[in-house]
């Protein structure tokens, strides 16, 4: 039975040209995490954190994506096109698969404040 829950940074905003941390946290389960996938709104994989192989950043994002902190992901040099949904997928055993959603809004304004709050989707 799947008892875990994914907590995410929820809806966040960040400045164009700046950076933002995407974070998901799996709690309330003793399941072993085999892998965490990070995906963009158009289904393209940004990065994978495999328990044995470590991080793999997909070539299209190598210049703008940094692994971590932890199982999270840092997006850099943000553009307006980065606005949209991001998904973390936890592959675990024996539970199976958990998925969390984050919505990122990239703002033109230089006074945009980066806001983040943890929530359970």
């Amino acid at each position: 039975m799947m008892t875990g829950t994914i907590e995410t940074t929820g809806n966040i905003s960040a400045k164009k040209g700046g950076s933002v941390i995407l974070q998901c946290h799996l709690s309330s389960t003793m399941a072993q995490v085999t892998q965490v996938n990070w995906e963009q709104h158009d289904h393209s994989l940004l990065a994978i954190r495999n328990a044995e192989l470590g991080w793999h950043i997909y070539p299209a994002f190598k210049d703008r994506v940094a692994p971590g902190p932890g199982l999270g992901l840092t997006l850099q040099s943000l553009t307006m096109n980065d606005t949209g949904e991001y998904f973390c997928t936890y592959h675990t055993y024996p539970d199976g698969t958990y998925r969390g959603r984050i919505f990122l809004e990239v703002l033109e304004s230089s006074v945009a404040e980066h806001s983040a709050r943890f929530q359970i989707p």
Epitope: Q32, N37, L45, I48, A51, E52, Y93, G96, T97
Partner: antibody, heavy 119, light 107 residues
Framework: EVQLVESGGVLVKPGGSLKLSCAAS????????MSWVRQTPEKRLEWVAT????????YYPDSVKGRFTISRDNAKNILYLQMSSLRSEDTALYYC????????????WGQGTSVTVSS | DIQMTQTTSSLSASLGDRVTITCRAS??????LNWYQQKPDGTVKLLIY???RLHSGVPSRFSGSGSGTDYSLTISNLEQEDIATYFC?????????FGGGTKVEIK
């Protein structure tokens, strides 16, 4: 071209043992999670075992746990399935499969090797 | 365990027809649903993963949809080479389980 070639399937008596092999080529074997899936004579598909890319973790359904052991040799690009205490219900066509890097699905399957458990 | 049910075990259709195959899970599988094609010679190929994502090299006449417990695979324009058995598989919870298959034949 990705290729998975299974071998080792034979007729075996109940209670017997058998080791299946799967030779992989056309991809970096050590980067991929691998599984065995079987197809019963009634054509039902059943997941049998999974092993992570480095071989650290292995997963099984209750139906084979304690009887089957999945292993891999990343230097030789070979996946194995050691089967023991075989039962008639283990009679099936055994497929070697590779998982997508994203782990969403099994993207390549071998042609299968036939195991018959009968006295 | 999650039970996967393909209520139609076989169907006949004409070349060029639109064919829809359905699959129902015994509980919500959150779109972690894959479709495989097995040809008469036993060859198995991945068609669609995560409900609607077309695997590389798969013709665009194949599409998938669904959510919750109900999912479907559609072949928009049936071709001779599509004669096969189609299986759904859930990847939400261990043990990963398959539907019983739907055999597509030519009328």
């Amino acid at each position: 071209e990705v290729q998975l070639v299974e071998s080792g399937g034979v007729l075996v008596k109940p209670g017997g043992s058998l080791k299946l092999s799967c030779a992989a080529s056309g991809f970096t074997f050590s980067n991929y999670v691998m599984s065995w899936v079987r197809q019963t004579p009634e054509k039902r598909l059943e997941w049998v075992a999974t092993i992570t890319s480095g071989g650290t973790y292995t997963y099984y359904p209750d139906s084979v746990k304690g009887r089957f052991t999945i292993s891999r040799d990343n230097a030789k690009n070979i996946l194995y399935l050691q089967m023991s205490s075989l039962r008639s219900e283990d009679t099936a066509l055994y497929y070697c499969t590779r998982w997508l890097l994203s782990l969403y699905a099994m993207d390549y399957w071998g042609q299968g090797t036939s195991v018959t458990v009968s006295s | 365990d999650i039970q996967m049910t393909q209520t139609t075990s076989s169907l006949s259709a004409s070349l060029g027809d639109r064919v829809t195959i359905t699959c129902r899970a015994s509980q919500d599988i959150s779109n972690f649903l894959n479709w495989y094609q097995q040809k008469p010679d036993g060859t198995v190929k991945l068609l669609i993963y995560y409900t609607s994502r077309l695997h590389s090299g798969v013709p665009s006449r194949f599409s998938g949809s669904g959510s919750g417990t109900d999912y479907s695979l559609t072949i928009s324009n049936l071709e001779q080479e599509d004669i096969a058995t189609y299986f759904c598989q859930q990847g939400k919870t261990y043990p990963y389980t398959f539907g019983g298959g739907t055999k597509v034949e030519i009328k």
